[in-house]
């Protein structure tokens, strides 16, 4: 395929990345999964311009990022290194709480109110926001 | 090894230019955003100037604004400070740094610019 | 612009002290501010961004904490490498701005 040239419609561009914004709630596997179909993949952060280009238009809302740590390690879902990655967990977190009753721990990153990260259960509705990187190749046959 | 180096640093009269310049290697450049900050002798740090990795965002000091001019070469791995109407207050020691978990995480070992007549 | 204030301006410390630095905001930054070391006649060093997380290589004995306006940087056992001078900066508006600086002296 050839590289994308522009966003897709109703996704935001930033440094040559595209993003979208959810406006409903999904368990984060559901969301990992609508991203995967849009030839995307959940947010990966890696730089506070991109922290705070995110943190700007989810707004102080509980929203998923593509971060976890259900096969035991912290991974980003794109292979960024998790351990010198950027990190903006709150104090004390993550912290596997096991309090919620829910069952097992906390094993999925999401964006709090104030920006900053926290792990909570997977099987939260919350919003994501999904990333497409501008310069790999698209997916779409090219035109004849 | 991420390293950044400074150059063009040097003697100037007040309303001369410079052309400083940071060659970087060890990490994709093109990948990250770039600062310059400055230390006048015995003072502390003063941010200067700020570019994108794709230089479609650039922020100056209101003190240089309209005198300086940032830009980059992804394919040479440089950055780059035009400073022109130098003024005696602009005399200090030119870092440029990388941005990636905060605007300043690497830097590099400065270049020494001394304006004066 | 955010003027970025530190205190104390300098403190004298004995290796193994505990060391707690403090930088307040003119207005609030949220949680984006960075910590610096530098040495004389050398370049800074960051060693703490967003408030409270540990750069790269940079020993755990440092630490951030804060958010708003008012932020800290605890150094829980003083070693001889850290006598030097170390610098708040806040990232969350342009112009990005510096505080003056804190001096950690040998007692």
């Known amino acids: 395929g050839s590289e994308r040239t522009c966003c897709p419609v109703n996704w935001v561009e930033h440094e040559r990345s595209c993003y979208w914004f959810s406006r409903s709630g999904k368990a984060w596997a559901d969301a990992d999964n609508y991203c995967r179909l849009e030839d995307a993949h959940l947010v990966v952060v890696t730089s506070w311009e991109e922290q705070k280009f995110v943190q700007h238009h989810i707004g102080p809302v509980n929203t998923w990022m593509g971060l976890h740590d259900q096969n035991g390690p912290w991974k980003w879902v794109d292979g960024t290194d998790y351990e010198t990655g950027f990190k903006n967990w709150r104090p004390e977190q993550p912290d596997d709480w096991y309090g919620h009753g829910l069952g097992g721990g906390e094993d999925c990153a999401h964006f709090t109110d104030d920006g900053r990260w926290n792990d909570d259960v997977c099987q939260r509705p919350y919003r994501w926001v999904c990333e497409t990187e501008l310069d790999k190749a698209s997916q779409e046959p090219p035109l004849l | 090894e991420v390293q950044l180096v400074e150059s063009g640093g040097g003697l100037v009269q007040p309303g001369g230019s410079l052309r400083l310049s940071c060659a970087a290697s060890g990490f994709t450049f093109s990948t990250y955003s770039m600062t310059w900050v400055r230390q006048a002798p015995g003072k502390g740090l003063d941010w200067v100037s700020y570019?994108?990795?794709?230089?479609?965002?650039?922020y100056y000091a209101d003190s240089v604004k309209g005198r300086f001019s940032i830009s980059r070469d992804n394919a040479k791995n440089s950055l780059y400070l035009q400073m022109n109407s130098l003024r005696d207050e602009d005399t200090a020691l030119y870092y440029c740094a990388r941005s990636a978990f905060s605007p300043f995480d690497y830097w590099g070992q400065g270049t020494l610019v001394t304006v004066s007549s | 612009d955010i003027q970025m204030t530190q205190s104390p301006s300098s403190l004298s410390a004995s290796v193994g002290d505990r060391v707690t630095i403090t930088c307040r905001a003119s207005?609030?930054?949220?949680?984006?501010l960075a910590w610096f070391q530098q040495k004389p006649g050398k370049a800074p060093k960051s060693l703490i961004y967003v408030a409270s997380s540990l750069q790269n290589g940079v020993p755990s004995r440092f630490s951030g904490s804060g958010s708003g306006t008012d932020f800290t940087l605890t150094i829980s056992s003083l070693q001889p490498e850290d006598f030097a001078t170390y610098y708040c900066?806040?990232?969350?508006?342009?112009?990005?701005?510096f505080g003056g600086g804190t001096k950690v002296e040998i007692k």
């Open positions: 570019i994108s990795r794709s230089s479609s965002t650039i």
């Open positions: 900066q806040q990232y969350n508006n342009y112009p990005l701005t």
């Open positions: 207005q609030g930054i949220s949680h984006y």
